[in-house]
């Protein structure tokens, strides 16, 4: 009986630790996408609607803030699209890029952790164009560090929650 009690306590401890594991999945806020063809920071994301969720991390001023030191898996998926019903492309040669950036407040610095993308030729003869970028990686993050997303050509972003999103989850503590 004692072993059972110990076992259930162990399960409970494991479960509560898992529940306390920080994670975030943020989806693009389509009502507030900036314009521009150069690199711009995407600051408007949902954290609590549809597929978007956050726990033991903070979303503030367009940045995902780490609350616990640890090793995290970071990911981002960015979709670009253009349909002729919205007009024509002002240029057919495009650089479609995403940059995942870490900013440290304690020692003011900024680093690109991941980037992805391609140069594309989107011919005006086609009715529809689509391109998707997915990046992911494993990083040591400290409490207070901030993760942000920058993209090129934000006016071409696909605004659906299953298309443009980013997130993080803690995998293990720092020894």
């Amino acid at each position: 009986e004692k072993a059972m009690v110990d076992g259930s306590w162990l399960d409970l401890a494991k479960r509560s630790k898992l529940e306390a594991q920080p994670f975030a999945h943020l989806t693009i806020n389509a009502t507030d996408i900036p314009s521009g063809s150069h690199k711009v920071s995407l600051s408007s994301w949902y954290h609590d609607r549809g597929w978007a969720k956050i726990s033991n991390m903070t979303f503030s001023n367009g940045k995902l803030i780490v609350n616990q030191d640890g090793f995290y898996y970071l990911y981002a998926n960015i979709c670009f699209r253009h349909h002729e019903t919205s007009g024509d492309l002002a240029t057919e040669y495009l650089q479609l890029m995403v940059y995942v950036t870490k900013t440290s407040i304690k020692i003011p610095s900024s680093h690109t952790l991941m980037k992805g993308g391609s140069t594309k030729y989107w011919s005006g003869n086609s009715e529809f164009h689509f391109y998707s970028i997915n990046v992911g990686g494993f990083f040591k993050l400290r409490s207070g560090e901030e993760i942000s997303i920058e993209v090129s050509n934000p006016s071409l972003l696909d605004p659906d929650q299953d298309a443009t999103y980013f997130g993080a989850f803690k995998v293990r503590d720092i020894d």
Partner: antibody, heavy 126, light 103 residues
């Protein structure tokens, strides 16, 4: 304030060419596209083509492909539309119009024509 | 190629009347629909863009609605200066126009 001022009326014989100018003022010419639209007597408005004043890219209606040339002089903030091999059915009022979307910031030519020239009457008659 | 069809082709109404013009697209165009006013000898004027957004400087008696393939332009209280031909437009395609006259 934003203004588009077009050149004066023209009369041409069939087979000739005509070049209409459109001088822009009151905004950064290079940041926007200029469209050309015409209206023949008793007909609907008809889109002809656009030029991105920043990079010179152009797009034309299939109907005019091969007969139309659109150019721009950024120093003079002026766009030009030349139509060749004129026929009587090209008799129309020709308008230039600014695309409302800043093509540098937004990358899209949106086809919202927020400012128009006063129109240039081109008469093709033998 | 998308075709825009307006109705009616002309209408006559009294000052103060509510006037409605309809525009249909041959396929769905979301909300990418604009309305213009054209008076003889004058430059066309953008009234409504994106189906329902009022262009700056346009009187609030003009309004637009609709999405997909069916759209309307409404003049809530017709004024003498509203005598003109009205065109709907989606990218490269214009409707055939609706001529509005005063009774």
């Amino acid at each position: 304030q934003v203004q588009l001022v077009q050149s004066g009326a023209e009369v041409r014989k069939p087979g000739a060419s005509v070049k209409v100018s459109c001088k822009a003022s009151g905004y950064d010419f290079s940041n926007y596209a200029i469209h050309w639209v015409r209206q023949a007597p008793g007909q609907r408005l008809e889109w002809m083509g656009w030029i991105n004043a920043g990079n010179g890219n152009t797009k034309f209606s299939q109907k005019f492909q091969g007969r139309i040339t659109v150019t721009r002089d950024t120093a003079a903030s002026t766009a030009y539309m030349e139509l060749r091999s004129l026929r009587s059915e090209d008799t129309a009022v020709y308008y230039c119009a600014r695309d409302s979307s800043n093509a540098v910031r937004g990358i899209i030519i949106a086809y919202y024509f927020d400012y128009w020239g006063q129109g240039t009457l081109v008469t093709v008659s033998s | 190629e998308i075709v825009m069809t307006q109705s009616p082709s002309s209408l006559s109404a009294s000052v103060g009347d509510r006037v409605t013009i309809t525009c249909r697209a041959s396929q769905s165009i979301s909300r990418y629909l604009n309305w213009y006013q054209l008076k003889p000898g004058k430059a066309p004027r953008l009234l409504i863009y994106g189906a329902s957004s009022l262009q700056s400087g346009v009187p609030s008696r003009f309004s637009g609605s609709g999405s997909g393939a069916e759209f309307t332009l409404t003049i809530s209280s017709l004024q003498p200066e509203d005598i003109a031909t009205y065109y709907c437009q989606h990218t490269r395609a214009f409707g055939q126009g609706t001529k509005v006259e005063i009774k």
